[in-house]
């Protein structure tokens, strides 16, 4: 079941997926000039069983200038006895991420992509907050929201974090400055709290906020 | 509450233009694709087209290419199905729905009854 | 693109079970596992009953169950009641980006 709204935006933080629940989207975008192949995919889907996950279907972006004028050969979604075995890895992911059941990577870049990309998550969704650079956990509750269903509905949970300046407060007793790059990832989705000096993007992509969509940018 | 909300019926004479409407509301409604369906009197359903709010790429039925426009205004959330030249056999309901997740149409309008007759 | 097939009509009486076949090609059914099921009440909207071939959204009965074979899908209603009746219609996405449904069932509940 999709999730009707986007993670709850905090001041001052981004969120991001460590892995993506089975039936999340992630939409065929492309850069300025450039447009999904005519009969491309429209998104990718992180579909599977129960003992491997991975990305159905390839976004293809072609220029806007020049038309097709020969045909081009599709990569289209696989039929479910043909599916890939092996997982779609990107040299940028850290081996872990998508050790969790029913959960797909982040997928690799593709030709011409937009700088943003929009996910589509669904019920079951764990996303993480970090304090964006220059800024500080204040606070040390759980940094991470899921997507619930409750009485048919889907709501996100609220993260519990604060990220202020670094000159606005001392820093609070035994937490540590934020690293350059803290190798600490959460082991459970269910048991872990997450603040900003645990947690750390682990790709070459940052989550950025916009209103009404959840986007990753390319920096 | 994730809706989609389609324009009032339409009683129109043969050759005559007409658009309607579908607004998307409560979900990113320009993220999400949104797909045109013809349900002709007793008759079943029909894939027109879906379009793409966000940049309006559009893809047609081959049976409907030619012989409707799909566009979007994603500033005001909304999709449209427009006729240049209406015909009697254009006398339909039509639906409008968001694609979802594994290429299904997961929220439907309501539809809109366009009635063409001379 | 021709319409997937399925039967016209199909009725049984309340607690018994129906099946309804969607047969398309190896272009659409047989190619991927994007089928779906629509349930249409008289004078309603289409409804989502289930995508992914099995899958079902919240909501719906597990009473509600699919399977696909080759390039035949097919609807199973267990414990027939009289507000299923309805018409059904199966949907396929296809190997060139676009969409296909079926005809349609017509489901008395006697």
């Known amino acids: 079941e999709l999730c009707d709204d986007d993670p709850p935006e905090i001041p001052h933080a981004t969120f991001k997926a460590m892995a993506y629940k089975e039936g999340t989207m992630l939409n065929c975008e492309c850069k300025r000039g450039f447009r999904r192949i005519k009969s491309g995919s429209l998104y990718m889907l992180c579909t599977g069983n129960s003992s491997h996950s991975s990305w159905d279907n390839q976004c293809q972006c072609t220029s806007s200038a020049t038309r097709n004028t020969t045909k081009q050969v599709t990569p289209q979604p696989e039929e479910q006895k043909e599916r890939k075995t092996t997982e779609m890895q990107s040299p940028m992911q850290p081996v872990d991420q998508a050790s969790l059941p029913g959960h797909c990577r982040e997928p690799p870049p593709w030709e011409n992509e937009a700088t943003e990309r929009i996910y589509h998550f669904v019920v079951g969704q764990m996303v993480y907050y970090q304090c964006v650079q220059g800024y500080r956990a204040l606070h040390r509750g759980p940094a991470e929201s899921v997507c619930k269903m409750t009485h048919g509905k889907t709501r996100w949970t609220q993260p519990q974090l604060i990220c202020t300046g670094e000159m606005e407060t001392s820093q609070f007793p035994g937490e540590e400055k934020p690293q350059a790059s803290p190798e600490g990832r959460p082991e459970s989705e269910t048991s872990c709290l997450v603040t900003t000096t645990d947690f750390q993007i682990q790709t070459e992509m940052a989550a950025t906020m916009e209103t009404s969509i959840f986007t990753t940018e390319y920096q | 509450q994730v809706q989609l909300v389609q324009s009032g019926a339409e009683v129109k004479k043969p050759g005559e233009s007409l658009k309607i409407s579908c607004k998307g509301s409560?979900?990113?409604?320009?993220?999400?694709?949104i797909g045109w369906v013809r349900q002709m009197p007793g008759k079943g359903l029909e894939w027109m087209g879906i379009?793409?709010?966000?940049?309006?790429?559009?893809r047609y039925s081959p049976s409907f290419q030619g012989q409707v426009t799909i566009s979007a205004d994603k500033s005001i959330s909304t999709a449209y199905l427009q006729w240049s030249s209406l015909k009697a056999s254009d006398t339909a309901m039509y639906y409008c729905?968001?694609?979802?997740?594994?290429?299904?149409?997961?929220?439907w309008g309501r539809g809109t009854m366009v009635t063409v007759s001379s | 693109q021709s319409a997937l097939t399925q039967p016209a009509s199909v009725s049984a009486s309340p607690g018994q079970s129906i099946t309804i076949s969607c047969t398309g090609t190896?272009?659409?059914?047989?190619?991927?596992?994007?089928v779906s099921w629509y349930q249409q009440l008289s004078g309603k909207p289409p409804k989502l009953i289930l995508y992914?071939?099995?899958k079902r959204p919240s909501g719906i009965s597990d009473r509600f169950s699919g399977s696909k074979s080759g390039n035949t899908a097919s609807l199973t209603i267990s414990g027939l009641q009289a507000d299923d009746e309805a018409d059904y219609y199966c949907?396929?996405?296809?190997?060139?980006?676009?969409?296909?449904f079926g005809g349609g069932t017509q489901l008395t509940v006697l």
């Open positions: 729905a968001r694609l979802g997740s594994y290429y299904a149409f997961d929220i």
């Open positions: 409560g979900y990113s409604s320009t993220s999400y694709w």
């Open positions: 379009i793409y709010p966000g940049d309006s790429d559009t």
């Open positions: 992914d071939v099995s």
């Open positions: 949907s396929s996405y296809t190997r060139s980006s676009t969409w296909v």
């Open positions: 190896s272009s659409d059914v047989g190619a991927y596992i994007y």
